[in-house]
């Protein structure tokens, strides 16, 4: 396993209907065709999985059909949205990639980006 | 070296508005927020609301809410603090501040001092 | 009025060790910590302590932050007479969508 260098932003503030969207970069030593990146949570000491895909360079990101994830690709960039964020959801949010084929394998992980996410104002009753 | 440079002082009518920007330098301005922090003569910090720079997206502390506006030039690395219909308890050196890993207010500009007076 | 409560004032002797307490709530301090900041007359604050009680680079030893429940604590060893400054707390609560401060709290070194 090699080390390889991600990079992402330091802090993003969700958009008011609870998307957040990053870029993940990451430096490439070689020429890799299938990638997996990681998105993870960091809360506390705690650290759990938000979504996942595994792509071929060149080709769109393949989420699972239920992930709050969807995501593009650009060389070794790739542009991530997370969905369906609550302020409860604010936290760490690491990007984790891996270069699976061809061999070597190499694995990076970013400092992570602190996503801050906003409730929008519950609209007031109205007289109908 | 990361540097936060604001504005000089300003002295202002009730009613007006004012502008105070803050000019940043030593690290990639949009993958950090820029957080507005006030502080009256002789008081505490208050936090004004902030913005990342990565998207444009604002927060506000609810009781400024419409009437700061905080905005950011990617091109100049440069944030802006416009608060306005200023009253005379606006006095106060506004502080501008990164939000750096974690959140975390880790680099302050030096301070404006804004002035309102009849 | 301030969501999270300092004590207004603490003095003590040179050398002399001295506890600052920042109280909270749920929704911040005890939720995700609290930042510490030290700001002397007529300069803008300064980070003194990250909210996982880690210190920035250049911050002296002296001082050490901790966390029980929903109140945080800064902890200045060994005072020396330039510690003589307001001390603030600062976190972010998460039910008001807001960064919070302390009402600060001023250290007198005698």
């Known amino acids: 396993c090699k080390a390889m260098h991600v990079a992402q932003p330091a802090v993003v503030l969700a958009s008011s209907r609870g998307i957040a969207s990053f870029v993940c970069e990451y430096a490439s030593p070689g020429k890799a065709t299938e990638v997996r990146v990681t998105v993870l949570r960091q809360a506390d000491s705690q650290v759990t999985e938000v979504c996942a895909a595994t792509y071929m360079m060149g080709n769109e990101l393949t989420f699972l059909d239920d992930s709050i994830c969807t995501g593009t690709s650009s060389g070794n960039q790739v542009n991530l949205t997370i969905q369906g964020l609550r302020a409860m959801d604010t936290g760490l949010y690491i990007c984790k990639v891996e270069l699976m084929y061809p061999p070597p394998y190499y694995l990076g992980i970013g400092n992570g980006t602190q996503i801050y996410v906003i409730d929008p104002e519950p609209c007031p009753d109205s007289d109908f | 070296e990361v540097q936060l440079v604001q504005s000089g002082a300003e002295v202002k009518k009730p009613g007006a508005s004012v502008k105070v920007s803050c000019k940043a330098s030593?690290?990639?301005?949009?993958?950090?927020?820029i957080s507005w922090v006030r502080q009256a003569p002789g008081q505490g910090l208050e936090w004004m609301g902030w913005?990342?720079?990565?998207?444009?997206?604002?927060n506000y502390a609810q009781k400024l809410q419409g009437r700061v506006t905080m905005t950011t030039d990617t091109s100049t690395s440069t944030a802006y603090m416009e608060l306005r219909s200023l009253r005379s308890d606006d006095t106060a050196v506004y502080y501008c501040a990164r939000v750096g890993y974690g959140g975390y207010f880790d680099y302050w500009g030096q301070g404006t001092l804004v002035t309102v007076s009849s | 009025s301030y969501e999270l409560m300092q004590p207004p004032s603490v003095s003590k002797g040179l050398r002399q060790t001295a506890t600052l307490t920042c109280t909270g709530n749920?929704?911040?301090?005890?939720?995700?910590?609290a930042d510490w900041l030290q700001q002397h007359q007529g300069h803008p604050p300064k980070l003194l302590s990250y909210?996982?009680?880690d210190r920035p680079s250049g911050i002296s030893e002296r001082f050490s932050a901790s966390r029980s429940g929903s109140t945080a604590s800064l902890t200045i060893t060994g005072l020396q007479p330039e510690d003589e400054a307001d001390y603030y707390c600062?976190?972010?609560?998460?039910?008001?969508?807001?960064?919070?401060f302390g009402g600060g709290t001023k250290v007198t070194v005698l």
């Open positions: 913005i990342s720079a990565y998207n444009g997206n604002t």
């Open positions: 749920s929704n911040n301090v005890g939720n995700q910590g």
């Open positions: 909210r996982n009680n």
């Open positions: 600062l976190a972010w609560d998460s039910s008001l969508s807001a960064w919070v």
């Open positions: 030593g690290y990639t301005f949009t993958s950090y927020g």
